[in-house]
Interface confidence: medium
């Protein structure tokens, strides 16, 4: 599923991401935009043999199990394919674990490079939340 901007903002808010670990909803929507272009089925392969999955591009080396990433830790204890569902529950729950891990949203390269320090509230402007 490819979410609309406000549709995703509403879904993320429903799942409790607004101000989760101090990150406003705009940060999460911005991260999703530049990680996956709001596409729940996005997959991207990395040079280390791992793959990033879903709307928040969660990595198979650390967070989920895709059955083919050597040394996968599967810290979210889920199959990576669960992160590709049109229901973003699994991605949100895993993202909460990731953002609590110590580096905050710096874990997402796209957030670090495209969202951090910008007017992230623009990503939810005009949305009825």
């Amino acid at each position: 599923k490819v979410f609309g901007r406000c549709e995703l903002a509403a879904a993320m808010k429903r799942h409790g991401l607004d101000n989760y670990r101090g990150y406003s909803l705009g940060n999460w929507v911005c991260a999703a935009k530049f990680e996956s272009n709001f596409n729940t089925q996005a997959t991207n392969r990395n040079t280390d043999g791992s793959t990033d999955y879903g709307i928040l591009q969660i990595n198979s080396r650390w967070w989920c199990n895709d059955g083919r990433t050597p040394g996968s830790r599967n810290l979210c204890n889920i199959p990576c394919s669960a992160l590709l569902s049109s229901d973003i529950t699994a991605s949100v729950n895993c993202a909460k674990k990731i953002v609590s891990d110590g580096n905050g949203m710096n874990a997402w390269v796209a957030w670090r490079n495209r969202c951090k320090g910008t007017d992230v509230q623009a990503w939810i402007r005009g949305c009825r939340l």
Epitope: Q41, T43, G49, G67, R68, C80
Partner: antibody
């Protein structure tokens, strides 16, 4: 136990298309990548590409882009590979395998012969 | 693409001999190297994964070693059922690639 069952041998004319199937049993089909591999005598094994059935995500070896197209039907636990604009170079045995990085589980292979 | 070069192309041995098959990668692939056996008109069978981990049901006479770019499959005391083709494969990067194979034949 995990099994991959491929469709039977095909004899096709040059220029035609063919669709090979790979039915999976014994595991959760949607969560594992299915890989496709080509084997021609004297050419060893070549990786064609892969599909994740649960999402339809696909990746192709550059060499096979435009030649192979992958699809999957999660209701029947079956992956498909269509090969188009067939030439004699496409005559080979085609395998599906479960993509665990290494390939522990293989189909029995589908022999494709392209001949006028 | 990562090239895998296997040597020798053919190995003629007598049952009971011990042999080593080589696989060399064009660049480092860490430990992401796997070995397969293939007999005539059969699908490949995984023998060794990640350089040295035996696949389920594989006899203990098969072992693997190496790291980086140089890898070896060893067969301790070859049995008649071991004759056939052996391929290495890397899963370090895409596209996945295979070696050209080593044919193990009876002398």
């Amino acid at each position: 136990q995990v099994q991959l069952q491929e469709s039977g041998a095909e004899v096709m004319k040059p220029g035609a298309s063919v669709k090979i199937s790979c039915k999976a049993t014994g595991y959760t089909f949607s969560t594992y990548w299915i890989e496709w591999v080509k084997q021609r005598p004297g050419h060893g094994l070549e990786w064609i590409g892969e599909i994740l059935p649960g999402s339809g995500s696909t990746y192709y070896n550059e060499k096979f882009k435009g030649k192979a197209t992958f699809t999957a039907d999660t209701s029947s636990n079956t992956a498909y590979m269509q090969l188009s604009s067939l030439t004699s170079e496409d005559s080979a045995v085609y395998y599906c395998a479960r993509g665990d990085g290494n390939y522990c589980y293989w189909g029995q292979g589908t022999t494709l012969t392209v001949s006028s | 693409d990562i090239e895998l070069t296997q040597s020798p192309a053919t190995l003629s041995v007598t049952p009971g001999d011990s042999v080593s098959l080589s696989c060399r990668a064009s660049q480092s692939i860490s430990n992401n190297l796997h070995w397969y056996q293939q007999k005539s008109h059969e699908s490949p069978r995984l023998l060794i994964k990640y350089v040295s981990q035996s696949s389920s049901g594989i006899p203990s006479r098969f072992s693997g070693s190496g790291s980086g770019t140089d890898f070896t499959l060893s067969i301790n005391s070859v049995e008649t059922e071991d004759f056939g083709m052996y391929f290495c494969q890397q899963s370090n990067s895409w596209p996945r690639t295979f070696g050209g194979g080593t044919k193990l034949e009876i002398k």
